[in-house]
């Protein structure tokens, strides 16, 4: 029940996380003007990953798509990527975890096969989470270097008599989405994995013939060299597979006066 | 088209209050414009106020700040100017105008003259 | 506050003669954003209201003739009424849009010599 509720949580959250990673690739204030020295301005600019816009006070707005693809600076196309896999795996992710759900059945999928899935779409939503907060990040980097840029030459005069305002730009709502939003897909992510574990089905497939004995139980192994003795089998059923191999870990031997060399 | 039409008194007495209504006809006050006041004394030139915008926010000239209040009647399509503690200085022809694209003024009320005088 | 200067004060052209309103913005009125100019032109006859001939310095206003042009950019700023006409006497204004208060100019007075 905590496995089904942890892995349903974990597709929520990634799910909100995935959306808001969206919304903020699309959405338009990824910089906007800094208005810390003019709270109220009559002309306001803000930019986003495929378009800048200006905002009249009078009401009037305006947006410019960015056209030019080789013109653009190489972070701004960094950061596109960087969202656009991020989306693209929280995407396939999504997509994975739904069929992976246990409270959703299809065919006969074994709990085997919904535990790999899950676990798949737990890794999508960690790398799409990563992807989105780096973006943001390498986003935000760009913002802080060129806002003390333009604040050291903010003024420039024209012979002392005419006063040209550089425009700054400072974090725009979409950093902020951007940042949360990956931070859920992240969140997301790290749930389905712990899901994942639960999910992993109990070892119950055995393909070996057990003899009990009075005084020791004794499994025959078909292909294996060795006997366990009741003194060192182990309690937990574990999978045995075709062959009967298994590692040192799996089967402790201990001596006893069954044992052969 | 918008149209604009200011109405109120065309004398006032000094230190009292300016009050001026404009009357919007041919759009809604709701809509995406700023609603403007401009006067210009006789033979003079033009002084903007201040503005009421859509969401119903306002923003003055510093020079008249503390005197001026610009509102709003949504119900009857109306915005309207007050100027307190009004001086002969204040004698002026007031328009009421419309900004848009630009921050421009795109449409004009015919205005009205406003004498301060005992 | 930006103060905008117009020169001349006023101005005598012959009918059908080139006509140069200059006005200068004690800054710049260029927004970085969109690459335009907050400025607009208006015409005033007497006894009515002003009328919006240009605004973004340049983009002429609907139903304006096309013998009214605007150019400049930054702080220094033109109106050119390219062939005059009877009905063109009025005193012209312009206006900065980028930063408050809104400032006018004081006005040229165009008149036909």
């Known amino acids: 029940m905590a496995v089904t509720a942890c892995q349903g949580l974990g597709f929520v959250v990634s799910l909100i996380g995935i959306a808001g990673i969206i919304a903020a690739t699309c959405m338009d204030q990824w910089s906007t003007q800094d208005l810390y020295n003019n709270p109220v301005t009559a002309v306001f600019n803000y930019q986003g990953l495929w378009r800048s816009c200006v905002r009249e006070s009078s009401g009037f707005t305006e947006c410019r798509g960015y056209f030019t693809l080789l013109g653009l600076p190489a972070m701004l196309q960094a950061v596109r990527a960087l969202m656009i896999v991020g989306i693209v795996l929280g995407a396939i992710g999504l997509l994975v975890s739904i069929f992976a759900l246990k409270c959703i059945r299809i065919g006969s999928m074994e709990d085997s096969a919904k535990a790999n899935m899950t676990l798949t779409s737990g890794i999508m939503f960690i790398v799409s989470g990563l992807c989105a907060i780096a973006g943001v990040s390498v986003f935000a980097n760009m913002l802080v270097t060129n806002f003390w840029m333009s604040t050291a030459n903010m003024y420039t005069g024209m012979g002392g008599m005419v006063q040209t305002v550089q425009t700054r730009y400072t974090f725009g709502a979409a950093l902020f989405v951007g940042w949360v939003a990956g931070g859920l897909t992240l969140i997301g992510g790290v749930m389905m994995c712990i899901a994942c574990r639960g999910l992993a089905p109990e070892e119950t497939n055995y393909k070996a013939v057990s003899y009990h004995a009075s005084g020791h139980s004794v499994a025959y192994k078909p292909g294996g060299f060795k006997a366990s003795t009741g003194f060192g089998s182990n309690t937990k059923n574990k999978k045995i597979y075709d062959g009967g191999a298994r590692t040192e870990d799996e089967v402790q031997s201990y001596p006893s006066k069954h044992d052969y060399v | 088209q918008v149209q604009l039409q200011e109405s109120g008194p065309g004398l006032v007495k000094p230190s009292e209050t300016l009050s001026l209504t404009c009357t919007v006809s041919?759009?809604?006050?709701?809509?995406?414009?700023?609603w403007n006041w401009i006067r210009q004394p006789p033979g003079k030139g033009l002084e903007w106020i201040g503005y009421?915008?859509?969401?119903?926010?306002?923003n003055y000239n510093p020079s008249l700040k503390s005197r001026v209040t610009i509102s709003r009647d949504t119900s009857k399509n109306q915005f309207s100017l007050k100027l307190s503690s009004v001086t002969a200085a204040d004698t002026a022809v007031y328009y009421c105008?419309?900004?848009?694209?630009?921050?421009?003024?795109?449409?004009w009320g015919q205005g009205t003259l406003v004498t301060v005088s005992s | 506050d930006i103060v905008m200067t117009q020169s001349p004060d006023s101005l005598a052209v012959s009918l059908g003669e080139r006509a140069t309103i200059n006005c200068k913005s004690s800054?710049?009125?260029?927004?970085?954003?969109?690459?335009?100019?907050?400025l607009a032109w208006y015409q005033q006859k007497p006894g009515q209201p002003p009328k919006l001939l240009i605004y973004?310095?340049?983009t002429r206003e609907s139903g304006v003739p096309d013998r009214f042009s605007g150019s400049g950019s930054g702080t220094d700023f033109t109106l050119t009424i390219s062939s005059l006409q009877a009905e063109d006497v009025a005193v012209y204004y312009c206006?900065?849009?980028?930063?408050?208060?809104?400032?006018f100019g004081q006005g040229t007075k165009v008149e036909i010599k």
């Open positions: 105008a419309t900004s848009y694209y630009g921050n421009s003024f795109i449409y």
């Open positions: 041919g759009g809604s006050i709701s809509s995406n414009y700023a």
């Open positions: 009421i915008n859509y969401s119903g926010y306002t």
């Open positions: 800054q710049s009125l260029l927004n970085s954003g969109n690459q335009k100019n907050y």
């Open positions: 973004w310095a340049s």
């Open positions: 206006q900065q849009a980028y930063s408050f208060p809104w400032t």
